[in-house]
Structures are given as C-alpha cells and as structure tokens.
C-alpha cells in the first residue's frame, strides 16, 4: 500500500473550489522533495498540473496552488473554477518524476442540481437573508398565501398570510408585498441557518386554480480563507460582514471542538493568550473591521472566524466569515526576546529586527494600550516627532542595511511596563511585540552623571561627567545630545581607558563631555551610555540647563573645578590627557554593523543586531572632549 | 453536548451487505469531519473511511482494506453519517465506532483527531 495518503473521491460543484490533502510520511527527504498533482491518461502517464517546483500546467493558471507543509507533513492543492472537464482520475505525490511515491484520487465534478422547470435557485451565506419571490395571477390577489418546505412527500408551512409562523422561524421569515404590485408576493427569512436548506414551494390560492413556485435555497458554511503565515510574524483578519451589521457588536473568535471561544470583541473582551499582540480596528461605518494579532506561535495555528452579534459572541443564524491559519515554523524573522526587564530611573535598549530588503522603510515604535480593542500609539519613528512625556529618554538608532533597529528608553518608572510594538511602513509581517517589565531599583544604577544639577553659562566651559563600573571597562562609552530625531553621538573623552584592566579602580572610570565655549542651544538632555559595535547597552540621561553669566560672579572652568576635586597626580595625568586628545573625534558607529551578544546588568544575554544613528556632532558649539 | 449514537450492526454472513448509521447531534455537522473506525479486542482502533465537507465539495477517505467494498455518505440536513458496507469478510467483524472532529485538525486517518465518539456497535461477519 503507498506510504501516500489522501481523499479518494473528491466530489463538488461546477464553479466550486476543492481543497485537497495528501499525507507522507515524515522523514527529511519528504519535507524537502519536489510535491507534484498529476492527471492519469487513458494512455498510463500522468500529465503534470502543478508542483512544488513552480511548474503549473495551462489548463490551472490562475486557478490552482500547491502548498507543502513540511510541519504537518502534508501538501494542499487548491483548485478553483471547477468545471465538468475537471472530472478524472489524478495522482498526488512525491519525487523528482511522476512514477515516484502516490496516491489515487478521483475528482467529480457535477452540473449544478436540476429543479422543476420554474425552480429558482437562491444561494446565502449562514446568517444572511434571503428573499424569495412568488409571483401569482390576478385571480389570486385576495386568496391566502404561503411559502412552504417541502420534507419527503409533505410541505410544511413556513409563514403564510393568516399570520401563521412555524415555531422555527418565528422573528426570522415575514411575508410582505412591496408597493402597488398585485401579481407578486415575497418571503424574507433572515439569519439563516444549515437547516433552512432545502426545497420550499411558494403558494396563492388553494385547490386547482392555486398559483405555485419553487424555490432550491442553499445556505452555505463559510468556506475558510486559508492564510499562510510565518513563525514570529503577524496576521490581519479582513471581517466585511455587511451592513446589516454594522451596529451589532463585532468579535473574532478561534475554533475549539465544537464552540468558538472569542479572542476580541468590541465590547471589551480578550483572551489573555493575546494580550499586547492583537489590535481590533473598525474599518468604515458599513461594519467593516479587522483584526491584527502579532508575534505568531506555533499554537495560533488553527480556525478563526469573525461574527457580530449584540452580545460579542457566536450564534447561529448570524453571518461570519472564517480563515485557516497556518503558521510555518521555518520562520524568515529572526527570534528576539519577547520580555525586555528593567528597573526604576534605569534603561533599556530594545533591539527591533525588521526586513533587511526594507532598510529605507521608515520605523517606528508603539505602545500597545489595552483599552477597549487596544490601541498602539506611536511613540518614537524614523520621521516621527516623539511623543510628549518622553521628551529626553525615548530615541531610535537606525543603521540602513543592518536589519535591525534599536530603541532606547531610560529614566524608566514602572509606569512604563507594558506591550511595546516594533513596526515600519514596510513588510507588515515583521510586527514584532516586546513586553517590558519595570522593577523597583534595588542599587545605584551603574551609570552616574556628575554634577547631576547641570547649569552650564553661557562663553564659558562646561563638563559633565559620566561615572560608569569596571565590568564596562572593555565596551565603548559615549555621549549623545537628545533631539526629536534621534540622539547624535558627540566626541568624547574617555579617562578610565589609559589603566590597564587588570587594575580597574572602580573611582576612576570616567568619560566626560565638554561644551566650549557653551551657546545657548547647548541647553537640552545629553545621555552617557555604552555599547558594544551596534550593540547598545546602558544609557544615563541628564539635562543641561544655559543661563547667561551674571555679572560680577567669578569666572571659574568648571573643568578645573572638578579637577580640584580630585588629588594631585590624577589632575596631571587628566590635563596631559586632555591636551593629548583634544579635538580627537574618535566615536563613528558607522563604521560597524556585526552581529554580537551583549550580557546586561544581570540581565539575559540577547541576541541583537544593532545600530546607532550616526548623527553629527557638527551641531555643538566648540570641541567636546 | 455533543453525541453520536451509532446503528445497524449485526451479524450477517460473508458476502453479504450492511449499513451503519450515526445520528449526531450538539455539533456543527456539515463544518465537521466524520469517520468511522473500527476495533477488535485486544488491538487498536483502525481506521475505516472518514468524510469532511468544505463549502459544496465532499472529501471521502477510505483505508485500503475497505476500498472499493465500504461507501461513506453523510446527511447534513438529518445529521447523520452512513456507512455502507458490501462483500463484508470475516475479517471486518469488529466493534465500529463514529467520531467526529469539529476542528478538522491532523491527520485524517489517527483516532486522536477526533474529539467525539459514539458508544460503539458490534458487526460480525460469520464464514
């Protein structure tokens, strides 16, 4: 017997599509070799339609896919526009020729059932209404009349003009005449159900003289969209229910033995499994919405189908739409960390990958809001001003090219925990969801800026100080002045890398920032931070206040005011170094884009690829060491 | 709740004909896959024929033992599964059992992707 599996009769309708799986067994060679769907000849060979390969025959263009699924172990052929031609015999297997590992499958594709001569076929969606039509002669006008369904031999009345409703289709069918017309009644029955299906006979008059109609109504199942998606990228559900629903409360809801548990509705239900990864925006005032869900897992996978009903749930007899969502493991977007921790008045560095093809596409960064059907607003963009109240902390590191971008955001409260979204105007699939946890600082963070009440003068010199820990003795330290658009590196002057690491004394490691002579657009945040080539670490934020110099006040360096501070020989060593390095540039992160691990405060070490925004430093006033 | 409730076993003799029937009610039958399966004591569940419905198309699968002898037919507007057996053997005597599997998960052929049984009913075909 073949080791291939699939239906053996596969029966359907002209103009219908079939979906047809066929099983092998799970071994590498499977997953990986050519998927073929072949029609048997009179003749004995097997004329290729379609494969794996790419090759499809032109009798299924446009109409007909072939999917592996190397997961599951299956591969689907779809094929639309059924037409009677299609019926025969067909092979659906595997190998490098059609002789290799099959399966027999037999297609059938009939003609559209034959009715009585005046039947009038009426085909609806579950949910929806249909209306049908029953004309009779004038001599009827005033007799009774009625739709019925026909069971075997019998028909049982539905509605009829007496104001009789059978039980089952009470607040579902009326029967009405529009206007003036005297020869034509009609019968609406809405929020179909499967059973409603069948053979109905519409009635005027009794006896011999009665006028009679008939009508075929097939109510259909949704058939699933199939939706293929990757591993850690997103999916949007498209719902267009109609107007008829368009002020009836909209939810998407996943399949599960036989009920449908609801994920999102707009009445504020959400499944905790989807919490900071799912967004349900409405569309238009037609009932159009759509529901995005991010960072796909493996056990997304499955049947979702999106309704609407006053109460945000599944009933029968109300229109829905439905998907398959398949989720491929072999994923293009690179696995990054789902749970960034930080802790109060610290920072994070969130590395966001996106598609390295896209590296002009514009990024942003969102925060996720549970309200009602969650809402991610921007925050920080490649071209977007960042929001207020993150003025001086919030900055985006763009490296084109480098697929990945990062996000820094220091001075952290625990107001800040929640779902973070990476997202660019580009590929819509690499929406990746990060969610930050913000505890309360236990130590001193390891980054301290000195003096932390900083009001520079205008004409004179100004330094500020960054005090960092022996274990960033080997990583790269720099300043950057905060703007709207990012945060530019500036040169600096790093005082703990003349000492050998071997005798790190933790006192000493220091990088500072000088302003001379300060201007007053000077004024503003400036952070001290460490990175490793692309990958950011660390950041410190302080702000830098300009005032003009008061008359009468000394004029005292605060470079050499600082210096006093210290003992003899450090000054002599600083102010060589100081001469030695002045008007050094010696930070340009444009010159990396590796691939490094970072291991952070206790923290996990992440895998990040990262980049920093090359800004110029051409926009502070004198050299800054 | 879901139940499926099966008829129509029996014993006849070989050569002879049979058909099964399952009533089920509690489930969406016509966006279901149904199957038959079928046990001797002391063995696994094996596979018979399943049946599964997408839109207006109809999918029949059949185990090659059965291929060509047993037919699988499904009512949806009675919701009920149907299982004609011809040119029974001896050796498909066995407890047949109904299943369905709302979600149309894994593979068609495995016991384990059928969330609903029936109790079970007895065929026995004598030589």
């Known amino acids: 017997q073949s080791p291939i599996f699939g239906p053996q009769d596969v029966s359907s309708i002209e103009g219908n599509s079939v979906s047809i799986t066929c099983y092998y067994p799970d071994t590498s060679v499977n997953r990986h070799t050519r998927k073929y769907w072949c029609r048997q000849g009179a003749n004995g060979y097997c004329a290729t339609l379609i494969s794996s390969n790419g090759y499809l025959s032109k009798e299924y263009s446009g109409r007909a896919s072939l999917i592996n699924f190397p997961e599951n172990s299956t591969f689907v052929i779809n094929i639309a526009h059924l037409t009677q031609e299609d019926t025969g015999s067909y092979k659906c297997g595997l190998g490098t020729t059609n002789r290799g590992l099959f399966f027999d499958v037999s297609l059938e594709v009939s003609q559209v059932p034959e009715f009585p001569n005046d039947t009038h076929v009426y085909t609806k969606d579950i949910g929806r209404t249909v209306t049908i039509e029953c004309r009779f002669k004038e001599g009827n006008a005033h007799s009774k009349k009625s739709l019925c369904k026909k069971r075997g031999e019998a028909c049982e009345v539905v509605i009829d003009s007496t104001e009789y409703v059978d039980p089952s289709y009470k607040d579902r069918a009326i029967l009405f005449m529009k206007g003036t017309s005297r020869d034509i009644f009609y019968v609406n029955i809405s929020h179909l159900i499967p059973s409603d299906a069948g053979l109905y006979v519409c009635q005027a008059g009794e006896g011999p003289s009665a006028d009679k109609n008939n009508a075929d109504l097939q109510v259909l199942e949704p058939e699933p969209e199939l939706l293929y998606k990757d591993l850690r990228s997103s999916v949007t559900f498209e719902c267009d229910l109609g107007r008829e629903v368009a002020n009836d409360a909209k939810y998407l809801c996943r399949k599960n033995k036989e009920t449908c548990d609801v994920i999102i509705n707009t009445l504020g239900k959400r499944d905790p499994a989807f919490e900071g990864r799912i967004l349900l925006t409405p569309r238009d005032d037609n009932g159009r919405f759509s529901v995005l869900i991010t960072g796909l897992r493996k056990e997304d996978a499955g049947h979702y189908q999106c309704g609407a009903h006053s109460s945000g749930l599944p009933q029968e007899g109300w229109p829905v739409q439905a998907w398959q969502l398949f989720v491929n493991e072999e994923s293009t977007i690179p696995n990054s960390r789902s749970v960034v921790k930080g802790v109060t008045g610290g920072s994070v560095a969130i590395v966001c990958p996106y598609n390295p093809k896209e590296s002009s596409s514009l990024k942003y960064w969102c925060h996720w809001e549970a309200d009602e059907n969650g809402r991610c607003p921007v925050l920080v963009g490649t071209q977007a001003l960042v929001q207020e109240g993150y003025e001086g902390r919030l900055a985006l590191f763009d490296q084109p090219g480098s697929g990945a971008y990062t996000v820094i955001l220091n001075q952290l409260t625990t107001q800040d925990s929640g779902f973070y979204w990476c997202l660019t105007d580009g590929d819509s699939r690499w929406r990746t969801t990060i969610e930050l946890q913000v505890a309360e600082a236990t130590k001193k963070p390891d980054l301290e800026v000195t003096p932390q009440n900083a009001t520079a003068v205008i004409g004179e010199t100004f330094t500020i100080s960054c005090h960092y820990p022996c274990k960033f003795y080997s990583q790269e330290k720099y300043w950057c002045k905060w703007s709207n658009d990012g945060c530019h590196i500036l040169p600096s002057h790093d005082e703990g890398a003349r000492q050998s690491s071997v005798s790190c004394d933790q006192s000493s490691q220091i990088v500072s920032m000088t302003l001379n002579p300060v201007k007053k657009e000077d004024e503003g945040w400036y952070w001290c931070g460490v990175k490793e080539g692309q990958v950011y670490g660390e950041t410190t934020a302080i702000y830098v206040a300009v005032e003009e110099r008061t008359r009468g006040s000394p004029h005292i360096n605060p470079t050499d005011a600082n210096a006093r501070a210290k003992d003899a020989p450090e000054e002599e060593a600083m102010e060589s170094s100081v001469r030695e390095d002045e008007n050094k540039a010696n930070l340009d992160p444009r010159l990396f884009a590796d691939e490094r691990e970072i291991q952070n405060a206790g923290d996990q070490a992440q895998e990040n690829r990262a980049s920093g925004n090359a800004g110029s430093a051409g926009g502070q006033s004198g050299s800054s060491k | 709740e879901v139940q499926l409730v099966e008829s129509g076993g029996g014993v006849v003799q070989a050569e002879d004909s049979l058909r099964l029937s399952c009533a089920a009610s509690?489930?969406?039958?016509?966006?279901?896959?149904m199957g038959w399966f079928r046990q001797v004591p002391g063995k696994e569940r094996e596979f018979v024929a399943a049946?599964?419905?997408?839109?207006?198309?109809?999918?029949?699968y059949y185990d090659d033992s059965v291929k060509g002898r047993f037919t699988v037919s499904g009512d949806n507007a009675k919701n009920t599964l149907d299982l004609q057996m011809k040119g029974l053997k001896p050796e498909d005597t066995a407890v047949y059992y109904c299943?369905?599997?709302?979600?149309?998960?894994?593979?068609?052929?495995?016991?384990?992707?059928?969330?609903?049984w029936g109790q079970g009913t007895q065929v026995t075909v004598s030589s």
């Open positions: 299943a369905a599997d709302p979600n149309y998960y894994g593979d068609v052929r495995t016991s384990g992707t059928y969330q609903y």
């Open positions: 049946i599964g419905w997408s839109g207006r198309s109809t999918y029949r």
């Open positions: 509690g489930l969406p039958f016509s966006s279901s896959r």
